[in-house]
C-alpha cells in the first residue's frame, strides 16, 4: 500500500473522554421533515454550541426543534447560572430525575427506565406509551448517565465538570485519559442507537458517545438513524476519528487518510449538552 492509502487517524488506545448528553436530541441534526411549509424554528448546533434558526417543513423531523430561541437555550445550552453546585458538594441533577416513575394514562407495556430517588438507582418500569413524564429513558445507560451518582457521591458528569472539594472550583471530570480531545465527527455519531420500526434483526454497529466506543446493536431493517454501520471498522472510521488528540502547544498536525492528505487544526474545547 502506498502512503496515500494508509489510515492514520489519531486515536489513543485508552478510553476516550465521554460526551455527556443530557438530552441526546440536542445532538440531532436539524431536520426540516418531508413537508413543504416554511416555519421558522430553532435547533441546537453541537458544533457551534449555539441555538440557531432553521426552516421547518411542518411535519415529522425530530425533537431538536424549538418554537423559540429561549426554549432551545433552556433545553440544550448551559449558562453560568445552571452550573451552580449544591453546597453538599454534589452536582445538581436535572429536576426530572426526582419525579416518580409514571406509566402514563395509556397501556402499551413498553420497557423503559427511570431513576428511583429512594434506591438512588435506575430501574426498569412498564411505560404505557403516552404522556408520563421525563423520568423515562429508553436505555438503562442513558438513565444512569443522566441521573445516577458516580463514585465518591459525585453525580455522573452532566456538564463534564464536577466540584473540586478543595477550592470549590469547577474542574473537568476525571477520565481515563487527559481532556485533550475535541469532537470533529459527524453529528449523528452523537445520536443514540435506533433499531427502527421493522422486524428484521441485522447485526450493526453504532458509536456510543458516552463511552467513546463502537458497539453492536440489532437493526430492524428500516428506519432508524445514521448512527448505523455494517462493520465496527466503518463505525470507528466515521466516528472515532472525530476525537482528535491535541498537540501540547496547539498548532497543526498532519493526518494521513485514504486518498487524501488533510491538515487538521487542533484546539481543545469540550462539548457538553445540558438540558434543564
Amino acid at each position: 500500500d502506498s502512503e496515500e492509502d494508509e489510515e492514520h487517524t489519531i486515536i489513543t488506545d485508552t478510553e476516550l473522554p465521554p460526551l455527556k448528553l443530557m438530552h441526546s436530541f440536542c445532538a440531532f441534526k436539524a431536520d426540516d421533515g418531508p413537508c413543504k411549509a416554511i416555519m421558522k424554528r430553532f435547533f441546537f448546533n453541537i458544533f457551534t454550541r449555539q441555538c440557531e434558526e432553521f426552516i421547518y417543513g411542518g411535519c415529522e423531523g425530530n425533537q431538536n426543534r424549538f418554537e423559540s430561541l429561549e426554549e432551545c437555550k433552556k433545553m440544550c445550552t448551559r449558562d453560568n447560572a445552571n452550573r451552580i453546585i449544591k453546597t453538599t458538594l454534589q452536582q445538581e441533577k436535572p429536576d426530572f430525575c426526582f419525579l416518580e416513575e409514571d406509566p402514563g394514562i395509556c397501556r402499551g407495556y413498553i420497557t423503559r427506565y427511570f431513576y428511583n430517588n429512594q434506591t438512588k438507582q435506575c430501574e426498569r418500569f412498564k411505560y404505557g406509551g403516552c404522556l408520563g413524564n421525563m423520568n423515562n429513558f429508553e436505555t438503562l445507560e442513558e438513565c444512569k448517565n443522566i441521573c445516577e451518582d458516580g463514585p465518591n457521591g459525585f453525580q455522573v458528569d452532566n456538564y463534564g465538570t464536577q466540584l473540586n472539594a478543595v477550592n470549590n472550583s469547577l474542574t473537568p471530570q476525571s477520565t481515563k485519559v487527559p481532556s485533550l480531545f475535541e469532537f470533529h465527527g459527524p453529528s449523528w455519531c452523537l445520536t443514540p442507537a435506533d433499531r427502527g420500526l421493522c422486524r428484521a434483526n441485522e447485526n450493526r454497529f453504532y458509536y456510543n458517545s458516552v463511552i467513546g466506543k463502537c458497539r453492536p446493536f440489532k437493526y430492524s431493517g428500516c428506519g432508524g438513524n445514521e448512527n448505523n454501520f455494517t462493520s465496527k471498522q466503518e463505525c470507528l472510521r466515521a466516528c472515532k476519528k472525530g476525537f482528535i488528540q491535541r498537540i501540547s502547544k496547539g498548532g497543526l498536525i498532519k493526518t494521513k487518510r485514504k486518498r487524501k492528505k488533510q491538515r487538521v487544526k487542533i484546539a481543545y474545547e469540550e462539548i457538553f449538552v445540558k438540558n434543564m
Epitope: 411535519c59 394514562i105 397501556r107 406509551g129 403516552c130 404522556l131
Partner: antibody
Framework: QVQLQQSGPGLVKPSQTLSLTCAIS??????????WSWIRQSPGRGLEWLGI?????????RYAVSVKSRITINPDTSKNQFSLQLNSVTPEDTAVYYC?????????????WGQGTLVTVSS | DIVMTQSPLSLPVTPGEPASISCRSS???????????LNWYLQKPGQSPQLLIY???NRASGVPDRFSGSGSGTDFTLKISRVEAEDVGVYYC?????????FGQGTKVEIK
C-alpha cells in the same frame, strides 16, 4: 356499558370551593385499563382539560398548570366514584364541568362522558 | 402547551354532500411507533362530547363509516363522506402527545 353520573351544586360563591362528584357504573375507578378526568367547557375557553387520575401499581394524578394550585381530584374506591375540588373560585371558573373516562387499553381517548354540570360562580 | 387550531370554525353543509374539517397542531403528534396522538369528538346540541376517531384514523365503536380521520405530523383532517342531518354539532380535535391535554376551538357543522 360504562356510565358516569355527575352530582354537585350548580352555584358557588366567589372564593369558595367548587365540589363535584362523578359516580361510575360499568367499570371500576381502580381499573388499570382506564383513567378518570375532569374537563370543563365555557364560551370563552372552549373545552379545557383540568386533570386526571389513574391507578396502576399506585395512584397517579396530573393537573393542568392553569389550575394546579387550586385543584384536587380524588378517587373514592368504596363508592366507586371520583371527585373534583377547585378552591378559591372566581367568576372565571363558571363553566359546564364534565367528568370523563379515558380508555387506556384500545382507544386512548375519552370514550365516556358524564352529563355535564353547569357551575355558576356568583355572589 | 400544544395549540390545536381548527378550520373552518363554522361549516354550513348540504345533506348528502361531503364535508371536511382541518386541525393543525403546533408540534408533531406522530410517535415513532406510528401512533398518532390525536382524537376527534362530536358534541351534538345539548349533549356531552362523544369520541368519534381515535389515534388519528380509527373509528370508535358505533361510529358510522362515513366518518374518517387522516393526516400525520401536524396536519389532520376529519372527513364526512355524505353528511346526514344527525351529524350537526361541534367537532373537536384533541391531542395527547403532552400535558396539558388540549382541544381545538371547535368547528360548528350546521345544515344549510
Amino acid at each position: 356499558q360504562v356510565q358516569l353520573q355527575q352530582s354537585g351544586p350548580g352555584l358557588v360563591k366567589p372564593s369558595q370551593t367548587l365540589s363535584l362528584t362523578c359516580a361510575i357504573s360499568g367499570d371500576s375507578v381502580s381499573s388499570d385499563s382506564a383513567a378518570w378526568s375532569w374537563i370543563r367547557q365555557s364560551p370563552g375557553r372552549g373545552l379545557e382539560w383540568l386533570g386526571i387520575i389513574y391507578k396502576r401499581s399506585k395512584w397517579y394524578n396530573r393537573y393542568a398548570v392553569s389550575v394546579k394550585s387550586r385543584i384536587t381530584i380524588n378517587p373514592d374506591t368504596s363508592k366507586n366514584q371520583f371527585s373534583l375540588q377547585l378552591n378559591s373560585v372566581t367568576p372565571e371558573d363558571t363553566a359546564v364541568y364534565y367528568c370523563a373516562r379515558w380508555d387506556s387499553d384500545k382507544m386512548w381517548g375519552f370514550d365516556d362522558w358524564g352529563q355535564g354540570t353547569l357551575v355558576t360562580v356568583s355572589s | 402547551d400544544i395549540v390545536m387550531t381548527q378550520s373552518p370554525l363554522s361549516l354550513p353543509v348540504t345533506p348528502g354532500e361531503p364535508a371536511s374539517i382541518s386541525c393543525r397542531s403546533s408540534q408533531s403528534l406522530v410517535f415513532r411507533d406510528g401512533n398518532t396522538y390525536l382524537n376527534w369528538y362530536l358534541q351534538k346540541p345539548g349533549q356531552s362530547p362523544q369520541l368519534l376517531i381515535y389515534k388519528g384514523s380509527n373509528r370508535a365503536s358505533g361510529v358510522p363509516d362515513r366518518f374518517s380521520g387522516s393526516g400525520s405530523g401536524t396536519d389532520f383532517t376529519l372527513k364526512i363522506s355524505r353528511v346526514e342531518a344527525e351529524d350537526v354539532g361541534v367537532y373537536y380535535c384533541q391531542q395527547y402527545d403532552s400535558y396539558p391535554l388540549t382541544f381545538g376551538q371547535g368547528t360548528k357543522v350546521e345544515i344549510k
